[in-house]
Every structure is written in structure tokens, then in C-alpha cells.
Amino acid sequence: VLEVYYTSLRCRCVQESSVFIPRRFIDRIQILPRGNGCPRKEIIVWKKNKSIVCVDPQAEWIQRMMEVLRKRSSSTLPVPVFKRKIP
């Protein structure tokens, strides 16, 4: 559900939303840390209706959700955190 990508690409998000999305409608969350061509952290949410949205990293709900997912991934198997480096 939670994925962290380190990329050398430019920013992926043109605009960001802060509108809440319930977790049951989320397939996965992709986190792109700032740096390497993009000056800001980006969060991309892949939804179960196959649409994709960039979420404002400052939105309280996404911070809360990522914290919950991190806690679950450290204590249980079903919610892995993937880290992948792309040169």
C-alpha cells in the first residue's frame, strides 16, 4: 500500500489535492521524496477506480493515514513498505 520511490525525474505532480480519500478506496500510495530534480516531496495516490491523484503532503488526513500504515507495516505482514531506488 505504501511505496517510497527515489527518482532522478522532475516533479510528477502538476497540481495537488487535499480532499480526503477513505483508505478503502485507495490501492496504493507512492511517496517521492524531494530532491533529484524536484524541490518538494510528492505523494501520489492510486485509487481503486483506476484514477490517480497527487495529494498535498501537508494535508492532515494523508499524514495520519501514512502514520497508520507505517505502524501496521512494522508490526504486521499485510501492509508492506516498498523502497526502490531508480538511478
Epitope: V19, F20, P22, R24, F25, N49, R72, T76, L77
Partner: antibody, heavy 121, light 106 residues
Framework: EVQLVESGGGLVQPGGSLRLSCAVS????????MAWVRQAPGKGLEWVAS????????YYRDSVKGRFTVSRDNAKNSLYLQMNSLRAEDTAVYYC??????????????WGQGALVTVSS | DIQMTQSPSSLSASVGDRVTITCKAS??????LTWYQQKPGKAPKRLIY???ILQTGIPSRFSGSGSGTEYTLTISSLQPEDFATYFC????????FGQGTKLEIK
Amino acid sequence: EVQLVESGGGLVQPGGSLRLSCAVSGFTFSDYYMAWVRQAPGKGLEWVASINYDGGDTYYRDSVKGRFTVSRDNAKNSLYLQMNSLRAEDTAVYYCATEEDYDGSYVMDAWGQGALVTVSS
Amino acid sequence: DIQMTQSPSSLSASVGDRVTITCKASQNINKELTWYQQKPGKAPKRLIYNTNILQTGIPSRFSGSGSGTEYTLTISSLQPEDFATYFCLQQSSLYTFGQGTKLEIK
């Protein structure tokens, strides 16, 4: 008092169309995700579709994708379900329900009284 | 898709009995489970959400527990008005209801 009132049910032939409405009062409609749930006669409950606050995001169970469309009009405090290419297996009581506010504690909390849709020739 | 297996499908009990209904999920649903009561011709009524939080106005004889894939609804002392059908609902990934448990008077 929270109220959800469905209308638009009835008898329709296979392949036909029907539009259900759900009139809402007693809470700030635009603050909630909304859902449609159905129940075939004598059977269990089945989630049909959900829609986000402004109608820009919709979700459907696989068996109704491409046939049903959920929509809303926040100015009219109304939720809709357009049902096309109806099949006998769509026969059910259709309920609208509040689905989600920000903190998640209102999931499927308030329900309407239901609208019966019968698909038969 | 997550499947919910509810058991038993029907249950006969007497007033004052303690009753337990179980729902098993096909995968971990992280306590995102709701229980409903439904009477004939009526809409479902929410009893418990997030596994164990009692809905306002619901008597304390109803309780919920569980984690991972297994969840239970317990009625500690059945009252005449409790004879109805009960459903569980997982809301971890989209929505799936259990098949229902019809609670009848013995």
C-alpha cells in the same frame, strides 16, 4: 433529525432503465461520501456504488460497472443512481446511506427506507 | 476482493441467553468492521463500528471484538427485541457484507 428518502423504484423490463433518487435532510450533505446498497428479496446486503463529496470520484461493484451511474446534486441535497441495461439479478430493495465523513466514524450509519426495483418481463 | 464468511447462518436462542456471531475475513481487515441489525421490512441499523465501538443509543449488552481476520458480535443477555438478522460489514477495502445470521426464538 437525519433523514434519507429514496424514490423512483418500480417494475421494469430486462434491458430497461430506471433512475433512483435519495433526498437527504438533517445534516450537511456535501460533507459526506454517500453510497447505494441493495438487498435482493430474502437475501443479504450488497454494496453497489459510492460517491465522494463533490461527485468527482465514483466507485462501483464489478457487476454494475458500465451499467449503473451514481451522481449527486449538493445544491438539491440529492443522491441519484441511474440504472441501465437492467437484469433480473438487479431486482432488490435499494438503500442510500451516508458513507464517510472526515474521521470515518459515520460509515454506513444512516440509511433510507429503501426503494424496491423489480426487473421482470 | 475481500470475502466475509459469517456464521452461523441461523441461530435459535431464548431470552436471557448469551449469543455469539462470528465473521471471518479472507484477509486482514485491520479492525475495520461494522455490525448491523435488521428487522423484516426495515433498513439495517448500525450497532457497532470499528470492531468494538458501540453506536450511540445501542444497549451495552451488545459488544464486538476481534482483530486480523476474525471478529465476533456478542449479545450478553438476549432480549425479545433482539430477535432479528445480523450482518457484518468489512470496510477495509471497498465493502463486503457477511451473508447474515438470522436469530430466532427457540
